[in-house]
């Protein structure tokens, strides 16, 4: 129950309070009792209940027509049952009595007004009245958890807008007001009330400029809302009629979690006595509802697609068709970002990631933003962000910035269990280099801080920088599957290749050609291949790097050897020792589900099959899962990039709810 | 062939920043690494900086490393150096320089280490 | 002071042949074969003349060779032209924190 004030009787002149229902208020009874009494009793209206508890130990005890011994030991508290219908018109006697004197009384008035801030603590998506419910103080995670949630009105309802619903002082219309969380303030006093009581409703300095509060006026036509609170209003006056009333609030968030705001935002009601104008108001009472901005979440492979895109660029019709061809199949949305505005950036996947931000009364897609900020700068927020789509972004718009930072290398693993700890919206996996050194690369810091500070999806650092590119797609995917997790990671594996294409050299077909049908590349014979002691040594130290995230992700994912799917790939080593596909990279894969769409590698033809294709279909369709290889040679792969680097997927949130995890 | 174009020198003050164009003709820069080489008057060459075709990493000199910034906008077919906090010791000509990348071989023959086409670099004085 | 060291100068007759040496270390001329050498004439821009050690672009003469022993890093000028007249500067890749270094310079005069 909330805490109520301290009220102080005294017999030299009756005492007038405030007692807010569903508060416990003290009553001083010793501070100002006649000198010669040694005890008292109560006697109370039937609207007040008086607990008198004497310790320790306490024993409590209802009011009856009992007397209590006066001494400091005895603590006597009210609570109200009912709102009063005029001031002061519930009464408490206390009666202290000595051995020597009369009876001599002390006189408590007490009005009893009902005061709550009401949110949707219960996370059922409906506001419901809150008086003898939880603490509303406090925001606990769990299925048994307790607090109300915000959404970061990030999206653009306003299709004329250039910016987010949230960076401005307006709610547009009802589509705007359903991004924001439902906050109603129930008042019953008397009605005369607030001719000597004032309600202010604040929020923490340091926290105005993470929220705005709309206030609800109803008129007779329409509903109109006006800011109450913002980074420019800490607090508001409101102008309450007597008698029972109630009043909405829209919350929106301005802020996602991050290093410097944890996530939660108290919004506080106060009430104030303001009946004597020669003295500051005097605070009553509060009531204080606590908010935790729901975190930015990202989708792993296993969730199903609901949209593609990619870009339109010079001569990657063929490749378009093909991604076409697999969304339909998929049954998704296909978004294609023509020439004029991309570009010539097809880079779909460096540019952003989507993900979703969730609140119990409502779901939003929501566009992470990269700063890599090349030829798709404005895509995210000219084509992607509108309507019920959200948008963010953070670290420089303006250099300083690395190749870790392009989205290729910000991933998300299926949920897992690790030594106990569920992680039921999986874990962010980015790249990073091993150790810091003049020129090693890392993830910025900005973006790392946003990632971590999001908390339900513990984020993992592998290795990366000895990649070109320097991106985890290039050597990691994730499959759905109908067993074990219900994924498989799936890693590039030059021990694979190197075994399969030795295999084929036992069988007689060392003269069988790599890149076989590809004008003006150089052809390789699987034999010169496996006799180039340099390209042995490249990928010896390539399976090295790639062996340390095995390892790493095994231990942070909770994996098994047989959760891992090695797909063979060569790699060789350019300018300053960085890694590159030695043909188009297969592990960088488009995943819709069941379909997949994976780089056409051009290896070696044997018995009228691709072997690599073959040896790939071998290990991933009996998970159910349908490999389409699509043709990228020239678009992507020799442009440093493959299918997944050049498309994006939209996918469905996870049925699991947020705040019934415990981070 | 590129041909490649350097701008943007002039005379600053010590403390200062500039930033230096390198723009290609004739081909598509996002097929070159690009280097960016200075020579001091009256000495020899020094390697500035480096930034591969794809634009994903970067190297420096040890005496430029934290000031000096490569970077390229493919679009424009232009290569960038933004130098700050500058010292009467970055006094040089400027050289932009470029190789073409080999995608050919079975293992690459180190393109990114030497420069096979040159612009005529542009004077930047570090002076008070 | 250079990371790599050349003679500050050489000369030769027209038709004789110089060579000009580049020391480095284990760390660079001694490691890679990405050792290049580059021609320049007063007042102009530097050209490659010699690439992975002994490589010549198309256009570069065969009068100039490159080769590499140990730590050092060679390029020979045979039948001396007077238009070989100019500074020549040698550079290798190095696993030293500047990964790219020049020689100080070798100014040939042909007599």
């Known amino acids: 129950m909330a805490q109520g004030t301290l009220i102080r009787v005294t017999p030299e002149q009756p005492t007038h309070a405030v007692c807010v229902l569903g508060t416990l208020t003290q009553l001083d009874i010793c501070s100002s009792a006649p000198e010669d009494c040694t005890s008292f009793s109560i006697n109370a209206s039937p609207g007040v209940v008086v607990d008198i508890a004497h310790g320790p130990p306490a024993k409590k005890k209802s009011t009856g027509s009992s007397t209590w011994p006066l001494d400091p030991g005895v603590e006597v508290t009210l609570t109200m049952k009912v709102a009063s219908g005029s001031t002061g018109d519930q009464k408490v006697q206390i009666s202290y009595y000595g051995p020597k004197t009369p009876p001599v009384k002390a006189l408590l008035y007490l009005t009893g007004v009902e005061i709550s801030l009401c949110a949707d603590i219960t996370r059922t998506g409906k506001v419901k009245p809150t008086r003898a419910v939880k603490d509303q103080r406090t925001w606990t995670w769990g299925p048994c958890g307790q607090g109300a949630i915000l959404l970061v009105n990030c999206d653009r309802d306003n299709l004329e807008s250039s910016a987010m619903d949230c960076e401005d002082d307006e709610v547009l219309d009802s589509e705007d007001l359903q991004d924001m969380s439902l906050m109603t303030l129930s008042t019953k006093t008397p009605k005369d009330f607030f001719t000597n009581h004032t309600l202010v409703l604040h929020v923490a300095r340091s926290e105005m400029d993470k929220v705005r509060v709309f206030q609800a006026t109803r008129g007779k036509l329409s509903s109109k809302c006006s800011v109450v609170l913002g980074p420019k209003w800490p607090s508001h006056y409101l102008m309450v009629p007597g008698g029972k009333h109630n009043m909405d609030f829209y919350v929106e968030a301005l802020a996602f979690p991050d290093t410097d705001f944890p996530g939660l935002i108290t919004l506080t009601i106060s009430l104030l006595d303001t009946s004597n104008l020669e003295l500051p108001e005097a605070v009553v009472f509060q009531d204080s509802v606590v908010f935790r901005v729901a975190p930015w979440i990202m989708t792993p492979n296993t969730q199903p697609p609901q949209e593609v895109y990619a870009c339109s660029i010079f001569e990657n019709e063929d490749f378009l068709k093909s991604v076409t061809t697999l969304a339909m199949k998929a049954k998704c949305k296909l978004t294609i970002c023509p020439e004029e505005e991309n570009m010539d950036d097809q880079w779909m996947q460096d540019e952003m990631e989507i993900g979703y931000i969730q609140a119990p009364h409502k779901t939003l897609p929501v566009v992470f933003d990269s700063p890599r900020n090349r030829g798709l700068k404005e895509f995210p927020i000219k084509r992607v962000m509108g309507p019920d789509f959200g948008y963010v972004t953070r670290g420089p718009q303006t250099g300083g910035i690395s190749g870790l930072d392009s989205f290729g290398n910000l991933e998300v693993s299926p949920p897992v269990t690790v030594r106990g700890k569920e992680y039921p919206l999986g874990r962010i996996l980015f790249g990073d280099s091993c150790y810091p050194s003049n020129d090693s690369r890392q993830m910025h810091q900005a973006l790392q801080d946003f990632l971590s500070a999001q908390q339900v999806q513990a984020p993992v650092k592998l290795y990366s920088d000895w990649l070109s590119v320097g991106h985890v797609d290039e050597f990691l995917s994730f499959v759905p599957a109908p067993d074990r997790k219900g994924f498989r990671l799936l890693l590039a594996s030059p021990r694979s290749c190197y075994k399969l294409f030795q295999e084929q050299q036992n069988e007689g077909h060392g003269e069988a050609l790599l890149f076989e049908g590809i004008k003006k590349k150089k052809q390789q014979k699987i034999k010169n291949i496996l006799s180039n002691k340099t390209l042995r040594e490249h990928n010896s130290f390539v399976e090295r790097c790639i062996d340390w995230n095995r390892e790493l992700l095994k231990r942070e994912l909770g994996l098994a050897e047989s959760d891992i799917i090695d797909i063979p790939q060569l790699f060789k080593l350019k300018e300053f020792s960085k890694a590159e596909a030695f043909f188009p990279n297969m592990v960088n894969m488009l995943v819709l589900g069941k379909h997949l769409g994976i780089p056409k590698p051009f290896g070696p033809v044997i018995n009228g099959r691709c072997c690599l294709e073959e040896k790939v279909c071998s290990l991933l369709e009996p998970l159910g899962l349908q490999c389409t290889f699509i043709n990228d040679f020239f678009t992507y792969h020799i442009r440093h990039g493959e299918v997944h680097c050049g498309t994006n997927v939209r996918r469905k949130p996870f049925s699991f709810k947020w705040w019934n995890m415990v981070p | 062939q590129v041909q490649l174009v350097e701008s943007g020198g002039g005379l600053v003050k010590p403390g200062g920043s500039l930033r230096l164009s390198c723009a290609a003709s004739g081909s598509t820069l996002s097929d070159y690494f690009v280097s960016w080489i200075r020579q001091a008057p009256g000495k020899g060459l020094e390697w500035v900086s480096f930034v591969n075709s794809a634009d994903t990493f970067t190297y420096y000199a040890d005496s430029v490393r934290g000031r000096f910034t490569i970077s390229r906008d493919n679009a424009k077919n232009t290569v960038y150096l933004q130098m700050n906090s500058l010292r009467a010791e970055d006094t040089a000509v400027y050289y932009c320089?470029?190789?073409?990348?080999?995608?050919?071989?079975?293992?690459?023959?180190?393109?990114?280490?030497?420069?096979?086409?040159w612009g005529r670099g542009t004077l930047v004085t570090v002076s008070s | 002071q250079s990371a790599l060291t050349q003679p500050r100068s050489v000369s030769g007759s027209p038709g004789q042949s110089v060579t000009i040496s580049c020391t480095g270390t284990?760390?660079?001329?001694?490691?890679?074969?990405?050792v290049s050498w580059y021609q320049q004439h007063p007042g102009k821009a530097p050209k490659l003349i010699i690439y992975n050690v002994y490589e010549r672009p198309s256009g570069v003469p065969d009068r100039f060779s490159g080769s590499k022993s140990g730590n050092t890093a060679s390029l020979t000028i045979s039948g001396l032209q007077a238009e070989d007249e100019a500074d020549y500067y040698c550079?290798?890749?190095?696993?030293?924190?500047?990964?790219?270094?020049f020689g100080g310079g070798t100014k040939l005069t042909v007599l």
């Open positions: 284990r760390g660079d001329v001694g490691r890679y074969n990405h």
């Open positions: 320089s470029s190789a073409t990348e080999e995608v050919d071989d079975i293992v690459a023959p180190g393109r990114g280490y030497y420069m096979d086409v």
């Open positions: 550079s290798s890749h190095s696993r030293s924190s500047t990964p790219v270094l």
